[in-house]
């Protein structure tokens, strides 16, 4: 079914500005991915977001204007998952090491790693620049979020049968409607405070029985502590 | 099968504006990104840029001062305008489509070109 | 800017002949590069998708291999229908083609 030109992220709405700090926009001349800052050298995207040259852009809403608390830091250090694979997405999660540290204050601040995985029916927030259009493009310029829940991985696997492994998991709605999309990826799935997804894929965006499918996180907090010790 | 066909002026004169249009035939225009790509004679292929239904576009760096991409639905038309043109602009003009192969994850990313135009040659001089 | 230095920039072979291109990055680009073939005044086509992916419809003579920065196209046994020019495409980051080659007969 069509959906109204104003629906964001697709079936969103957008984010007051500011609102989520930790947010990024991996840039190469172009927005290209979203990204989540966890402390105040790393950020955590997704790992086929990798490119060899990235400028990360914290502080940022709208991201085609200079609104004053944006910082735009290259990356130092960008550290694929070892066990990342783009035929399967499995482990899709990657490391930024900033060039600098990030400068923390109120539109710019970090979001803390899960203590416990996320658990089916918790509210989630999605937010990104990506596409807003279930079909066609259209790209906005200002941050977009969406309240979505985590389904259960008998749903998440019963929508992608035979695709989703240990380090993935499902948030959204099976009737379609609201869903992340194109130019999303990288970017943060928060629930109660803590990162727990990283937008990874979907059969398109939007679609019925085809919610999107992101990175568990929390099976990589030991990765992360230990890749972030090891190049500190 | 969808078919691309390149229109507009074959001369255009310096510091003038070249415009060139595409009609797309055998699908809809709404499903996929377009692009335009130039090749002066005996030379290899640039790319201008790429443009999406809803109007979103992404122009070549080096161009970008002077490229303007338009789509008109309604008439399954996108359209290339190049300002401030010189001598070495003259090139033959292809349209093209996205290969769109969005695959299934959620980056912007490009993907290249599966189907072409037969192109169109324009030539600037006075 | 991603350059795409091509190479060589014209070849001669034989028919049967096994025919190699190579294509550099000037930066990682993982395995965002497609090449297509172009006859003399007619649109290009696009053989080889993601370096080693053949499109739909395009014979298994070709074949890419390849990633991050260095790529190879190869014709495993060269056609007379096969006289064209070869573009490798970056599209990594916006879009970028090499210089092409150019296979003619001997």
């Known amino acids: 079914a069509p959906f109204d030109d104003d629906d964001k992220i697709v079936g969103g709405y957008n984010c007051e500005e500011n609102s989520v700090p930790y947010q990024v926009s991996l840039n190469s001349g172009y927005h290209f991915c979203g990204g989540s800052l966890i402390n105040e050298q790393w950020v955590v995207s997704a790992g086929h977001c990798y490119k060899s040259r990235i400028q990360v852009r914290l502080g940022e809403h709208n991201i085609e204007v200079l609104e004053g608390n944006e910082q735009f830091i290259n990356a130092a250090k960008i550290i694929r998952h070892p066990q990342y694979d783009r035929k399967t997405l499995n482990n899709d999660i990657m490391l930024i090491k900033l060039s600098s540290r990030a400068v923390i204050n109120a539109r710019v601040s970090t979001i803390s790693l899960p203590t416990a995985p996320p658990a089916t029916g918790t509210k989630c927030l999605i937010s990104g620049w990506g596409n807003t259009a279930s079909s066609g493009a259209d790209y906005p310029d200002e941050l977009q979020c969406l309240d979505a829940p985590v389904l259960s991985q008998a749903k998440c696997e019963a929508s992608y049968p035979g695709k989703i492994t240990s380090n993935m998991f499902c948030v959204g709605f099976l009737e379609g409607g609201k869903d992340s999309c194109q130019g999303d990826s990288g970017g943060p799935v928060v629930c109660n405070g803590q990162l727990q997804g990283v937008v990874s894929w979907g059969d398109g965006c939007a679609q019925k029985n085809k919610p999107g499918v992101y990175t568990k996180v929390y099976n990589y907090v030991k990765w992360i502590k230990n890749t972030i010790a090891a190049n500190s | 099968q969808v078919q691309l066909q390149e229109s507009g002026p074959g001369l255009v004169k310096p510091s003038e504006t070249l415009s060139l249009t595409c009609t797309v035939s055998?699908?809809?225009?709404?499903?996929?990104?377009w692009h335009w790509i130039r090749q002066p004679a005996g030379k290899g292929l640039e790319w201008i840029g790429r443009?999406?239904?809803?109007?979103?576009?992404y122009y070549n760096p080096s161009l970008k001062s002077r490229v303007t991409m338009s789509v008109d639905t309604s008439k399954n038309q996108f359209s290339l305008k190049l300002s401030s043109v010189t001598a070495a602009d003259t090139a033959v003009y292809y349209c093209?489509?996205?290969?769109?192969?969005?695959?299934?994850?959620?980056?912007?990313?490009?993907?290249?070109?599966?189907?072409w135009g037969q192109g169109t040659t324009v030539t600037v001089s006075s | 800017d991603i350059q795409m230095t091509q190479s060589p920039s014209s070849l001669s072979a034989s028919v049967g002949d096994r025919v190699t291109i190579t294509c550099q990055a000037s930066q990682d680009i993982s395995n965002y590069l497609n090449w297509y073939q172009q006859k003399p005044g007619k649109a290009p086509k696009l053989l080889i998708y993601?370096?080693?992916n053949l499109e739909t419809g395009v014979p298994s003579r070709f074949s890419g291999s390849g990633s991050g920065t260095d790529f190879t196209f190869t014709i495993s046994s060269l056609q007379p229908e096969d006289i064209a020019t070869y573009y490798c495409q970056q599209v990594d980051n916006f879009i970028t083609f090499g210089g092409g080659t150019k296979v003619e007969i001997k």
């Open positions: 993601d370096a080693s």
């Open positions: 093209a489509r996205d290969l769109t192969n969005y695959g299934i994850t959620k980056s912007i990313r490009f993907y290249g070109m599966d189907v």
């Open positions: 443009i999406a239904t809803s109007g979103s576009t």
């Open positions: 055998g699908g809809s225009i709404s499903s996929h990104y």
